[in-house]
Amino acid sequence: NFMYSKTVKRLSKLREYQQYHPSLTCVMEGKDIEDWSCCPTPWTSFQSSCYFISTGMQSWTKSQKNCSVMGADLVVINTREEQDFIIQNLKRNSSYFLGLSDPGGRRHWQWVDQTPYNENVTFWHSGEPNNLDERCAIINFRSSEEWGWNDIHCHVPQKSICKMKKIYI
């Protein structure tokens, strides 16, 4: 029976994934009962990705390691729509690391997952980035401009945002 074997496979995957993310929230995609897309609970989902707001304060490097241990990366923002979704879950009085850094301090910004940096899809606050020694990017709220990016020192602890592809079971 096709449905039975599909369910057995799904349960097997859930058991395999349970040691990394004990609880998954899944939805059926489209009309096909075969396709379930999941995010760990309590991550949020948008399009094909899952997002986690980490409220622990860590350096940029430690924040990225924390994400990668969970099978994710610091967030790579690809569109205005994605940023608009993300900011719904952020607190205005906090700053959050993005997966964007300039390791050499030469204004060669690079995303942690090697997505090409596209100057046309960036959301820097006006006047930012403004310091060659500030080599990591955060997203924060400024009353004059709402949400945008700022360059800061990488060792200064911040909250962070992790992003991973949805889990398909």
Partner: nanobody
């Protein structure tokens, strides 16, 4: 905690071959994408090759394409880097790294995407 151990390095002549191995502890190796990176003296650690958790997808840095082949054996909890036609510029310490992933097809190229690293094995290619 995942632990990794590389082996297979050594001193060879230009044009020779080596096969590096990476042994992983634990029984969940198949949940991890694997990458090989290298670091020459005084240089940044750089991406060499990566393979998805299923083994179906691979990525290579341009300078090793056609010479190096990455593979894995999930039953043996091991990964490999077959290096042919070695050149003096391949001289470096080679590291294997693992990254948890729920995608069977992604082969990650960013060194910061890998939280688990081995101690490295030295490869020296003389001319």
């Amino acid at each position: 905690q995942v632990q990794l151990q590389e082996s297979g390095g050594g001193l060879v002549q230009a044009g020779d071959s080596l096969r590096l191995s990476c042994a992983a502890s634990g029984n969940t190796f198949s949940m991890y994408a694997m990458g090989w990176f290298r670091q020459a003296p005084g240089k940044e650690r750089e991406f060499v090759a990566a393979i998805s958790r299923s083994g179906g997808s691979t990525n290579y840095r341009d300078s090793v394409k056609g010479r190096f082949t990455i593979s894995r054996d999930n039953d043996l909890n091991a990964g490999y880097l077959q290096m042919n036609n070695l050149k003096p510029e391949d001289t470096a310490v080679y590291y294997c790294a693992l990254r948890l992933t729920f995608s069977t097809t992604d082969a990650y190229t960013g060194k910061l995407q890998y939280p688990y690293w081995g101690q490295g094995t030295q490869v020296t290619v003389s001319s």
